[in-house]
């Protein structure tokens, strides 16, 4: 019945490591029966593959069908509105979805105290969906870097920054006591991927953690 419905205004990916989510904006004045059809194209295989015929949400998890993202030339996705027998034109993602579009995160940060130093260990992401051989460190095997930010709480928005090139790091607290909070933002020096700040990890430093030397 032609293409009477308006198309979704925009379609885009928001991706973290093995967490590849397609999003779109709804058509104006959609009805309760409006849903969205999603299709995927893998570069090198020039045909569209239908993924979902009728999604009523405004996002779709494409991780399972893009598991080879990190070893491929990337993907494009398209979405159209469907309402009964009517459908809109397709709206296609306006950029290629490739490894470069994946926002880097860390899994968590572990902190401990040793002789006045805060020792940190960065846990890399370990997504359940990832194939066994596709670890963060095997895909981003070189030039991993981390921006470390530390602040003393409470009520403090002032951070001290440090850049490290390993998953283990140490921070000198200059003899201060109190609660210190650390966040980490990953990057890969040879790549353009954006990074996200981790969840804050905090640790209390008291006088007992300092060794007195004469």
């Amino acid at each position: 019945h032609g293409t009477e419905l308006p198309s979704p205004p925009s379609v885009w990916f928001e991706a973290e490591f093995f967490h590849h989510i397609l999003h779109w904006t709804p058509i104006p004045n959609q009805s309760e029966s409006t849903c969205y059809e999603v299709a995927l194209l893998r570069y090198g295989i020039e045909s569209w593959n239908s993924i979902s015929n009728c999604s009523q949400t405004l996002s779709y998890d494409l991780t399972a069908v893009t598991l080879d993202l990190y070893h491929s030339n990337g993907y494009r996705a398209r979405v159209r509105a469907v309402d009964g027998s009517r459908h809109s034109n397709w709206t296609v993602t306006n950029t290629r979805f490739s490894v470069d579009e994946v926002t880097l995160t860390v899994g968590s940060v572990n902190l401990e105290i040793h002789n006045g130093f805060i020792l940190g260990k960065i846990q890399l992401p370990r997504p359940k969906m990832a194939p066994a051989n596709d670890t963060y460190e095997s895909i981003f095997s070189h030039f991993r870097e981390y921006e470390i930010a530390i602040r003393k709480v409470p009520g403090n928005f002032t951070f001290t920054h440090k850049k490290v090139k390993h998953e283990n790091f140490s921070l000198l607290t200059s003899g201060e006591v109190g609660e210190f909070c650390v966040q980490v933002k990953p990057s890969v020096a040879s790549r353009s991927n954006k990074g996200m700040w981790s969840k804050e990890e905090c640790i209390s430093l008291t006088r007992q953690y300092f060794t007195v030397t004469n």
Epitope: E16, T103, T105, V106, K185, W197, S198, K199
Partner: nanobody
Framework: QVQLQESGGGSVQAGGSLRLSCTVS????????MGWFRQAPGKEREGVAT????????YYADSVKGRFTISQDNAKNTVYLQMNNLKPEDTAMYYC????????????????????WGQGTQVTVSS
């Protein structure tokens, strides 16, 4: 194109109230650290309050605790700063900022840096 638009600034007497709004457009992450910062003439920009939109957790600078309240309306993509019992030292340009956080691993506020900033709204408190 990400845009943060502040509104609600103005002039008020000491002890009065104002409510600032920050509306985000062209921005998609549902999990963010949204913050309000301020800068008085000749001073450095300082953090005022932040909210983690993924969980509602809030954080305040000591100087505004008990007087200012940050809140969100996810349906309107808007963050508010309710400012009560205003003091002359609250006079500044107020800026809204946003930083996307991980959907998978979560995040915390404040973040050490913010990617997106508004143009600011002026607040003037006279004694």
């Amino acid at each position: 194109q990400v845009q943060l638009q502040e509104s609600g600034g103005g002039s008020v007497q000491a002890g009065g109230s104002l409510r600032l709004s920050c509306t985000v457009s062209g921005y998609t992450y549902s999990s963010n650290c949204m913050g309000w910062f301020r800068q008085a003439p000749g001073k450095e920009r300082e953090g005022v309050a932040t909210i983690y939109t993924g969980g509602g957790n809030t954080y305040y600078a000591d100087s505004v605790k008990g007087r200012f309240t940050i809140s969100q309306d996810n349906a309107k993509n808007t963050v508010y700063l309710q400012m009560n019992n205003l003091k002359p030292e609250d006079t500044a340009m107020y800026y809204c900022a946003a930083e996307p956080l991980s959907r998978v691993y979560g995040g915390s506020c404040p973040t050490p840096t913010f990617d997106y900033w508004g143009q600011g709204t002026q607040v003037t408190v006279s004694s």
